[in-house]
């Protein structure tokens, strides 16, 4: 029964798998982009690498009504230890510096690929 229970509940996803899935989702977004992503919405830029997942989520959470990034928002929330809601402003953001969502997603993909290569999964 113990063994069967293990099959029934797969347990938490390893961080390396979660990061790879997030990277794959960002690749999908960047490759399948035809019209301007999220109608060219702008998000806060980020100026540090530490605490990046929460900061990235805080930027993207302010983009509403954009189905293309909803999965990314959900996935990022799994990496961020605290609850993030729209309107939050992290010290990691560059004040008064906004960039297009499409560029932000592309930059996030670059950064996550580096983390994956370096084995930094959390």
């Amino acid at each position: 029964l113990t063994c069967l229970g293990g099959f029934a509940s797969p347990g938490p996803v390893p961080p390396s798998t979660a990061l790879r899935e997030l990277i794959e989702e960002l690749v999908n977004i960047t490759q399948n982009q035809k019209a301007p992503l999220c109608n060219g919405s702008m998000v806060w830029s980020i100026n540090l690498t530490a605490g990046m997942y929460c900061a990235a989520l805080e930027s993207l959470i302010n983009v509403s009504g954009c189905s293309a990034i909803e999965k990314t928002q959900r996935m990022l929330s799994g990496f961020c230890p605290h609850k993030v809601s729209a309107g939050q402003f992290s010290s990691l953001h560059v004040r008064d510096t906004k960039i297009e969502v499409a560029q932000f997603v592309k930059d996030l993909l670059l950064h996550l690929k580096k983390l994956f290569r370096e084995g930094q999964f959390n």
Epitope: I99, K106, K113
Partner: nanobody, 118 residues
Framework: GVQLLESGGGLVQPGGSLRLSCAAS????????MGWARQAPGKGLEWVSI????????YYADSVKGRFTISRDNSKNTLYLQMNSLRAEDTAVYYC???????????WGQGTLVTVSS
């Protein structure tokens, strides 16, 4: 869109110093390895120095080692190149650029001219 704007070039005497700056906008500067490249009159493009995204590692061409120092301020989205003990052969247009292995992430500035002459 993405912009890289160099400044600080000019005319300087041999043995003199200059500090180049590159103001970045339109992308997440803190996540990119960055560098300075140069092109001397009638010559090809040469990488001078590269700095990793966090600033933790730096690389220099042999021709500038010990004379040039690359640095960055991610809070200001700015890249710097401190050039000391300048020589006539350092005369070139200096370009600020992203330095990622994947050319999908390739961005370049317009360049700033450095002339070393007496």
């Amino acid at each position: 869109g993405v912009q890289l704007l160099e400044s600080g070039g000019g005319l300087v005497q041999p043995g003199g110093s200059l500090r180049l700056s590159c103001a970045a906008s339109g992308f997440t500067f803190a996540w990119y390895d960055m560098g300075w490249a140069r092109q001397a009159p009638g010559k090809g493009l040469e990488w001078v120095s590269i700095i990793t995204d966090t600033g933790g590692r730096t690389y220099y061409a042999d021709s500038v080692k010990g004379r040039f120092t690359i640095s960055r301020d991610n809070s200001k989205n700015t890249l710097y190149l401190q050039m000391n003990s300048l020589r006539a052969e350092d005369t070139a247009v200096y370009y600020c650029a992203t330095a990622e292995r994947d050319d999908t992430f390739d961005y370049w500035g317009q360049g700033t001219l450095v002339t070393v002459s007496s």
